[in-house]
């Protein structure tokens, strides 16, 4: 014997109180598959959550976060606060990046500035809390006479100007 409820399509439920007739889901509820004996309550996007997709009789509402927050967790179950560039979100809120670190995003953690000298390069632009350092060319990459590395000062005789 086939279960009469299996004929009930998505958007309906098999109503035991009415001889297993397929009844439409009540307002603010949905069933995303056929053969359901109940409809699920629609998710409500309130507070810091805002509605990205309205609930229908066959699919749940989808939420995202209001400006200043971003989604976390499956199906945007949480809204985490954005920080400013130059900050990171800690367990106790947004904190400025420590000296020597930067964050150019509104989320994520502060990362250390690039160490130019590890690649044999010089610092062309200093780092800030919001931006990484910019490494300049290595001395070997420079044409003669264009070195950014200051040569040692020549020995000076008294009364002479430096060369």
């Amino acid at each position: 014997l086939q279960d009469p409820c299996s004929n009930c399509p998505a958007g309906t439920f098999c109503d035991n109180n009415r001889n297993q007739i397929c009844s439409p889901c009540p307002p603010n509820s949905f069933s995303s598959a056929g053969g359901q004996r109940t409809c699920d309550i629609c998710r409500q996007c309130k507070g810091v959550f805002r509605t990205r997709k309205e609930c229908s009789s066959t699919s749940n509402a989808e939420c995202d976060c209001t400006p200043g927050f971003h989604c976390l967790g499956a199906g945007c179950s949480m809204c985490e606060q954005d920080c400013k560039q130059g900050q990171e979100l800690t367990k106790k809120g947004c904190k400025d990046c420590c000296f020597g670190t930067f964050n150019d995003q509104k989320r994520g953690i502060c990362r250390p500035w690039t160490n130019c000298s590890l690649d044999g390069k010089s610092v062309l632009v200093n780092g800030t809390k919001e931006r990484d350092v910019v490494c300049g060319p290595s001395p070997a990459d420079l044409s003669p006479g264009a070195s950014s590395v200051t040569p040692p000062a020549p020995a000076r005789e008294p009364g002479h100007s430096p060369q």
Partner: nanobody
């Protein structure tokens, strides 16, 4: 599959108590620090408390210190949050979360898995 399932939420009067549980599966529970966070209706995510894998080190947000106690039973793969002297400001969805290592602190989020949450409503 790594899973975290919270339970124990409900409606409680101001001044009352609740104990939340978080059942973990799919990973070696004792090897990882665990964290509770909460999402109040009009606010962003708020860190509540963290505990190291061994259970020796615990950390609390200032807003819950002295009222909430985090604990874990590694033999049962379960995390707990005992909440006392509850106020309306504690109304939120509470999520448990797995951190990425055995140690934790009150600074860095190092969360890689979240539960689905359990709702706590404090109302008279």
């Amino acid at each position: 599959e790594v899973q975290l399932v919270e339970s124990g939420g409900g409606v409680v009067q101001p001044g009352g108590s609740l104990r939340l549980s978080c059942a973990a599966s799919g990973f070696t529970f004792s090897n990882y620090a665990m964290t509770w966070v909460r999402q109040a209706p009009e606010k962003g995510l708020e860190w509540v408390s963290s505990i190291s894998g061994s259970g020796v080190s615990t950390y609390y947000a200032d807003s819950v210190k002295g009222r909430f106690t985090i604990s874990r039973d590694n033999s049962k793969n379960t995390l707990y949050l005992q909440m006392t002297r509850l106020t309306a400001e504690d109304t939120a969805v509470y999520f448990c979360a797995k951190e990425g290592s055995s140690e934790t602190d009150d600074h860095y989020y190092n969360v890689d898995v979240w539960g689905q949450g359990t709702t706590v409503t404090v109302s008279s």
